[in-house]
Amino acid sequence: KKVVLGKKGDTVELTCTASQKKSIQFHWKNSNQIKILGNQGSFLTKGPSKLNDRADSRRSLWDQGNFPLIIKNLKIEDSDTYICEVEDQKEEVQLLVFGLTANSDTHLLQGQSLTLTLESPPGSSPSVQCRSPRGKNIQGGKTLSVSQLELQDSGTWTCTVLQNQKKVEFKIDIVVLAFQKASSIVYKKEGEQVEFSFPLAFTVEKLTGSGELWWQAERASSSKSWITFDLKNKEVSVKRVTQDPKLQMGKKLPLHLTLPQALPQYAGSGNLTLALEAKTGKLHQEVNLVVMRATQLQKNLTCEVWGPTSPKLMLSLKLENKEAKVSKREKAVWVLNPEAGMWQCLLSDSGQVLLESNIKVLPTWSTPVQP
């Protein structure tokens, strides 16, 4: 007996071939001997089966000796043995219909779990193997679960159902709702404008929700809500904004915030949360601001940074085109009695400059100039 695997909702074609390449009489029946369809001369006739308007043949193939039974919008209950009677012969085909569905929404928040459920006909014993977009394989029976979804799990999951040494492939598109980056850091000189961007790692037709940016300044004892906003069909509207600092927010995606000036009192880290409509849980992105200031007071040239810096970052003071006068893994460095010239304060990581501030030291009778 030939075995054919079908997918729920799909179309299947069961073949029946005669030795003669001409149109002859044929009949398709199910295991209960109920006629599904057949022919009477040139005409296709239908029986009283439950397939009714979902079954057809292809008239143009009959004179090739092919008498297919085509079933559309397959259901699990269509699983059965189908018999084709042609030329005093009986051809039996066992059709097994499977369905694979994500038993929650296919749009899931980062960190949530994905459960895939296999629908199968009674008496079948299929095995399922799914491959995630990042190449991770998971195996199971009737259900497969993946906990702690990551951004790389977004995309097409390919699941193979095996039964009777035959296989049928399902493709399920999963969208992991997350920001493109879990964390970002912005380095700015004091007084510069700061741009924070929070690009999403997914695109959907309509995006509605609400969000807030909480800020923990390094100098402050507690965190503070800097801005709250609403998102409606990808349009951003500010609900409430703190007076200090006076943040501005873009009206369109990606979420974009502008801080007019980088000041030491703003240096610190923030957490932007976004709650999406009809979703439990929130999307998070951490953002950090590091601010640099270079000053000369009397005979002391000082360079300072505020904000979350890693211990391996190096802060240096050097006269232009010369070796560093001072270089430390600290948040403040200084030079006493600096020579006249253009001094550079550099914040670097393994030789890569992250932030640079220049200050001109004039001969002792002048006051310093910041370019």
Partner: antibody, heavy 123, light 107 residues
Framework: EVQLLESGGGLVQPGGSLRLSCAAS????????TSWVRQAPGKGLEWVSS???????YYLDSVKGRFTISRDNSKNTLYLQMNSLRAEDTAVYYC?????????????????WGRGTLVTVSS | DIQMTQSPSSLSASVGDRVTITCRAS??????LNWYQQKPGKAPKLLIY???TLQTGVPSRFSGSGSGTDFTLTISSLQPEDFATYYC?????????FGPGTKVDIK
């Protein structure tokens, strides 16, 4: 968007070979019979070949043994390998999807066509 | 193979005219007949299937009739966008064959 997009056409000498591709998108490709239909310059339409959902193949007598139709459902792509090309094979080759009516009478039609790719066989 | 013929091979008509195109099969094909419209440089477009069923989205000024060997495509009131070539096709047997086409142009 539901569409078919042909590629692979070009100028080839008599006796040469070409492989045409047709990329399907926006529908379940594996559920449909798919065909190649050609149209010689200034002439009418001529069916060339069809492939069924199970991979069964049908050809116009004049291309049998020279042309091979195939499909890759994982790539949603239909192919036509054309060998021993002749001047009379010069035409725009269209990829077309066959739709079954499900009237219970075996009616079908070409309900979706690609834009076509030109094959010129000339020395 | 089933041969399909069409008449006329071309016709000139004006906007608003009623246009009739006929298609004949070399043997009985019952109602296994489709009609397509093709504009220059474009792919064909399905108008009617099973001899008389209008494809979704096709204007109701198009209609098809006939059975057996003789079929008709009628455009009740010709519109500027209807100037094109029309083909009939049988799907009764393989190979599915097309008629040679009828070109409808502006008078």
């Amino acid at each position: 968007e539901v569409q078919l997009l042909e590629s692979g056409g070009g100028l080839v000498q008599p006796g040469g070979s070409l492989r045409l591709s047709c990329a399907a998108s926006g529908f379940t490709f594996s559920n449909h019979y798919t065909s190649w239909v050609r149209q010689a310059p200034g002439k009418g339409l001529e069916w060339v070949s069809s492939i069924g959902v199970n991979g069964d193949t049908y050809y116009l007598d004049s291309v049998k043994g020279r042309f091979t139709i195939s499909r890759d459902n994982s790539k949603n792509t239909l192919y036509l390998q054309m060998n021993s090309l002749r001047a009379e094979d010069t035409a725009v080759y269209y990829c077309a999807r066959e739709g079954l009516v499900f009237s219970g009478r075996g009616h079908w039609y070409f309900d979706l066509w690609g834009r076509g790719t030109l094959v010129t066989v000339s020395s | 193979d089933i041969q399909m013929t069409q008449s006329p091979s071309s016709l000139s008509a004006s906007v608003g005219d009623r246009v009739t195109i006929t298609c004949r099969a070399s043997r009985n094909i019952h109602d296994y007949l489709n009609w397509y419209q093709q504009k220059p440089g474009k792919a064909p477009k399905l108008l009617i299937y099973a001899a008389s069923t209008l494809q979704t989205g096709v204007p109701s000024r198009f209609s098809g009739s006939g059975s057996g060997t003789d079929f008709t495509l009628t455009i009740s009131s010709l519109q500027p966008e209807d100037f094109a070539t029309y083909y009939c096709q049988q799907t009764y047997s393989t190979p599915p064959t097309f008629g040679p086409g009828t070109k409808v142009d502006i008078k």
